[in-house]
C-alpha cells in the first residue's frame, strides 16, 4: 500500500496544530517532564513488517484521538484548534484503515499486530495515569503535548521511509 502524500501532509498539519495549542511557557514545566517509555521498537521499520508498522500508527492516532477528545482535554485546549486537530486525526485514521486492509486480510490484522497494538495502548495508558496523577494540570498537559509531538514526528519520519520502500 502506498500511503498517500495527503497522509504525510495531514500528519504535518496535525503537528503544526499541536505546536499551536501551547498555552503556557514551556520553561516553567521542566520539573514535570516524565519518561512515558515511548515504544520505539514497535515503529522500527527494519524489525517489523510494513503492515505491523501501519497498524501501530493507526493505534497511535486512535489513542491520540481518544486522549484529546476527553472532557479534561477540552478544558485544557483552544476549542477551534482542537476541532481542526480532530479532523486531521480522523482523516489519517481513514487513510491508514484503507492501507492496513490492503496490506493483509482484515481477519489477520488483529492477531498479527496484537503485540505492537498492546505496546501502543500501554504507552497511552501511562500517559493517562500521569495526567490523572498530576490532576490534569496545565504543565502536565504541556508535557503530554510535547510527548505526542515527539512520537508523531518519529512516526512521520518512518512513514516517509515506508513510502520510499514501495
Amino acid at each position: 500500500c502506498d500511503l498517500p502524500q495527503t497522509h504525510s501532509l495531514g500528519n504535518r498539519r496535525a503537528l503544526i496544530l499541536l505546536a499551536q495549542m501551547g498555552r503556557i511557557s514551556h520553561f516553567s514545566c521542566l520539573k514535570d517532564r516524565y519518561d512515558f517509555g515511548f515504544p520505539q521498537e514497535v515503529f522500527d521499520g527494519n524489525q517489523f513488517q510494513k503492515a505491523q508498522a501501519i497498524s501501530a500508527f493507526h493505534e497511535m492516532i486512535q489513542q491520540t484521538f481518544n486522549l484529546f477528545s476527553t472532557k479534561d482535554s477540552s478544558a485544557a485546549w483552544d476549542e477551534t484548534l482542537l476541532d481542526k486537530f480532530y479532523i486531521e486525526l480522523f482523516q489519517q485514521l481513514n487513510d491508514l484503515e484503507a492501507c492496513v486492509t490492503q496490506e493483509v486480510g482484515v481477519e489477520e490484522i488483529a492477531l498479527m499486530n496484537e503485540d505492537s497494538i498492546l505496546a501502543v495502548r500501554k504507552y497511552f495508558q501511562r500517559i493517562t495515569l500521569y495526567l490523572m496523577g498530576k490532576k490534569y494540570s496545565p504543565c502536565a498537559w504541556e508535557v503530554v503535548r510535547a510527548e505526542i509531538m515527539r512520537s508523531f514526528s518519529f512516526s512521520t519520519n518512518l512513514q516517509k521511509g515506508l513510502r520510499r520502500k514501495d
Epitope: A19, L30, K31, R33, Y34, E142, E147
Partner: antibody, heavy 121, light 107 residues
C-alpha cells in the same frame, strides 16, 4: 544527520557589537530548544540562556541577563547570541546545544563546534 | 539558582582503573542530572542523561547513579581516550547549572 554549525571566530574591540549564529539541520528546528554555554579560557562551562525557536520564548541565567540577547529565526533554522557592547571579559568560547524541551529525550545531545570570541584593544 | 558541586576537582588515574566522580546539588533535583565529557579544544559530549541513562554511542564502561541531591559518574575501566574533564549539570530548573568540572589526568 543532526548538525549544529556555528559561525566562525571573531576578533573585536571593546565597545563593539557582535552577533554569532548557530544553524541547525537534520532535525525539526522548532521541536528543540537551543541553549548557549560560555567557556572562558581555561575555565569550566557556564550556562547562559535558552530559547524555544517555535515561539522565541527566552530565558537567561541571572549572570547574563541584560548582558546578551538570544534570538532565533525559525525560517532559516538559526539561533543567535548577540552583544551590543563587548568587554574584554567576554573573551571566551561560546557553544550552542539543542535541548528536547518537555519531551523525554537526552538533554543537550548535539552541540555546535563553538565560536571563539576575542575582545581586545 | 541550584548550585552543583563536583568532587574531586581533579584526579590522577591509570588505564584500567575504576574512577568515580561525585556531584552534589544544593537542593533536590530528582533524577534530572546530565554528565558530559570534554576534551581540550572540543565541544562537550553528553555521556549520561536523567542520572543513569547512557546516551547512544557511549561505551558501557560509563555509568551514572543517584537521585535527589547526590549523584555519581563511574568509569569501570579507564581507557586512554577517557582522559578529559567531566561536568555534571542539573536539568530540573532554569537556569541549568554545571558543576565546576573534574579533570581526569594520567598518573
Amino acid at each position: 544527520e543532526v548538525q549544529l554549525v556555528q559561525s566562525g571566530a571573531e576578533v573585536k574591540k571593546p565597545g563593539e557589537s557582535l552577533k554569532i549564529s548557530c544553524k541547525g539541520s537534520g532535525y525539526s528546528f522548532t521541536s528543540y530548544w537551543i541553549g548557549w554555554v560560555r567557556q572562558m579560557p581555561g575555565k569550566g562551562l557556564e550556562w547562559m540562556g535558552i530559547i524555544d525557536p517555535s515561539d522565541s520564548d527566552t530565558r537567561y541565567s541571572p549572570s547574563f541577563q541584560g548582558q546578551v540577547t538570544i534570538s532565533a529565526d525559525k525560517s532559516i533554522s538559526t539561533a543567535y547570541l548577540q552583544w551590543s557592547s563587548l568587554k574584554a571579559s567576554d573573551t571566551a568560547m561560546y557553544y550552542c546545544a539543542r535541548h528536547p524541551g518537555l519531551a523525554w529525550a537526552p538533554d543537550f545531545d548535539y552541540w555546535g563546534q563553538g565560536t571563539l570570541v576575542t575582545v581586545s584593544s | 539558582d541550584i548550585q552543583m558541586t563536583q568532587s574531586p576537582s581533579s584526579l590522577s588515574a591509570s588505564v584500567g582503573d575504576r574512577v568515580t566522580i561525585t556531584c552534589r546539588a544544593s537542593q533536590s533535583i530528582n533524577r534530572f542530572l546530565n554528565w558530559y565529557q570534554q576534551k581540550p579544544g572540543k565541544a562537550p559530549k553528553l555521556l549520561i542523561y536523567a542520572a543513569s541513562s547512557l546516551q547512544s554511542g557511549v561505551p558501557s564502561r560509563f555509568s551514572g547513579s543517584g537521585s535527589g541531591t547526590d549523584f555519581t559518574l563511574t568509569i569501570s575501566s579507564l581507557q586512554p581516550e577517557d582522559f578529559a574533564t567531566y561536568y555534571c549539570q542539573q536539568a530540573i530548573d532554569l537556569p541549568f547549572t554545571f558543576g565546576q568540572g573534574t579533570k581526569v589526568e594520567i598518573k
